[in-house]
């Protein structure tokens, strides 16, 4: 035979935002301050997560539900429910270990976060250089050359092999 | 129960200097990267300094090269900033932060920091 999960246990009977008190007869107990339950049934609440330092709050703790951070500007979210703070560079730079770096020659950025990448490599395209590369904007490719008017040509030199996430120091 | 406590703050005068500390509990600190990072009244969050895990690597932001050393004690649990020449701009409240699985590796992000101290400097 089945019976009811409230015959079995009194816990379940327990609303989100308390916890079943065992040392006061297993009557429901609201979460203590800085603590929350999200589910019903449960025997403990669990510590609110503090967002401090790097991190700062976006969403309050309450009684059923967790606080939640983002972080601090100058510092982006990394991870699953912003579980680390990473510091941003500028366009044109990319996050070493020794702080930020400028892209090496023949690579760029633009973006806050992530690594130099190299620029377009139009010649593998048979295309040419329309607009040259800095380190904050990739090349522009143009037409190919064959397309160009007689007598005139563009050279694109190869971009520099390079390990992701590595600039020479 | 991951915590960071930093301590050492205060009012100095420029050209003075001060010693930040950082105790470390419910974690072992020799794990970890450790760095500082600071926030100036009005500003962003700005990257100090980090070392690595046994103290043999260490980096600095260009504008506090050659006046603060970083450094750690893993038996004491303890990360420090000794802070010389100290200049108006350094004013900022003073943060230490732990660099997360894999800091170095695949990512520089920060996954426990303390409540900071504050540093002032004016005469």
């Known amino acids: 035979f089945e019976r009811t999960r409230s015959l079995q246990d009194p816990c379940s009977n327990c609303p989100a935002g308390t916890f079943c008190d065992n040392n006061r007869n297993q009557i429901c107990s609201p979460c203590p301050p800085n603590s929350f339950s999200s589910a019903g049934g449960q025997r403990t609440c669990d510590i609110c997560r503090q967002c401090k330092g790097v991190f700062r709050t976006r969403k309050e703790c309450s009684s059923t539900s967790n606080a939640e951070c983002d972080c601090t500007p100058g510092f982006h979210c990394l991870g699953a429910g912003c579980s680390m703070c990473e510091q941003d560079c500028k366009q044109g730079q990319e996050l070493t270990k020794k702080g930020c770096k400028d892209c090496c020659f023949g690579t760029f950025n633009d973006q806050k976060r992530g690594i130099c990448r190299p620029w377009t490599n139009c010649s593998l395209d048979g295309k040419s250089v329309l607009v040259n590369g800095t380190k904050e904007r990739d090349v522009v490719c143009g037409p190919s050359p064959a397309d160009l008017s007689p007598g005139a040509s563009s050279v694109t030199p190869p971009a520099p092999a390079r390990e992701p996430g590595h600039s020479p120091q | 129960e991951v915590q960071l406590v930093e301590s050492g703050g205060g009012l100095v005068q420029p050209g003075g200097s001060l010693r930040l500390s950082c105790a470390a509990s419910g974690f072992t600190l020799s794990n970890y990267w450790m760095n500082w990072v600071r926030q100036a009244p009005g500003k962003g969050l700005e990257w100090v300094a980090n070392i690595n895990q046994d103290g043999s690597e260490r980096y600095y932001v260009d504008s506090v090269k050659g006046r603060f050393t970083i450094s750690r004690d893993n038996a004491k649990n303890s990360l420090y900033l000794q802070m010389n020449s100290l200049r108006a701009e350094d004013t900022a409240v003073y943060y230490c932060?732990?660099?997360?699985?894999?800091?170095?590796?695949?990512?520089?992000?920060?996954?426990?920091s303390g409540q900071g101290t504050t540093v002032t400097v004016s005469s």
């Open positions: 932060a732990r660099g997360g699985e894999g800091y170095g590796v695949d990512h520089y992000g920060l996954d426990v």
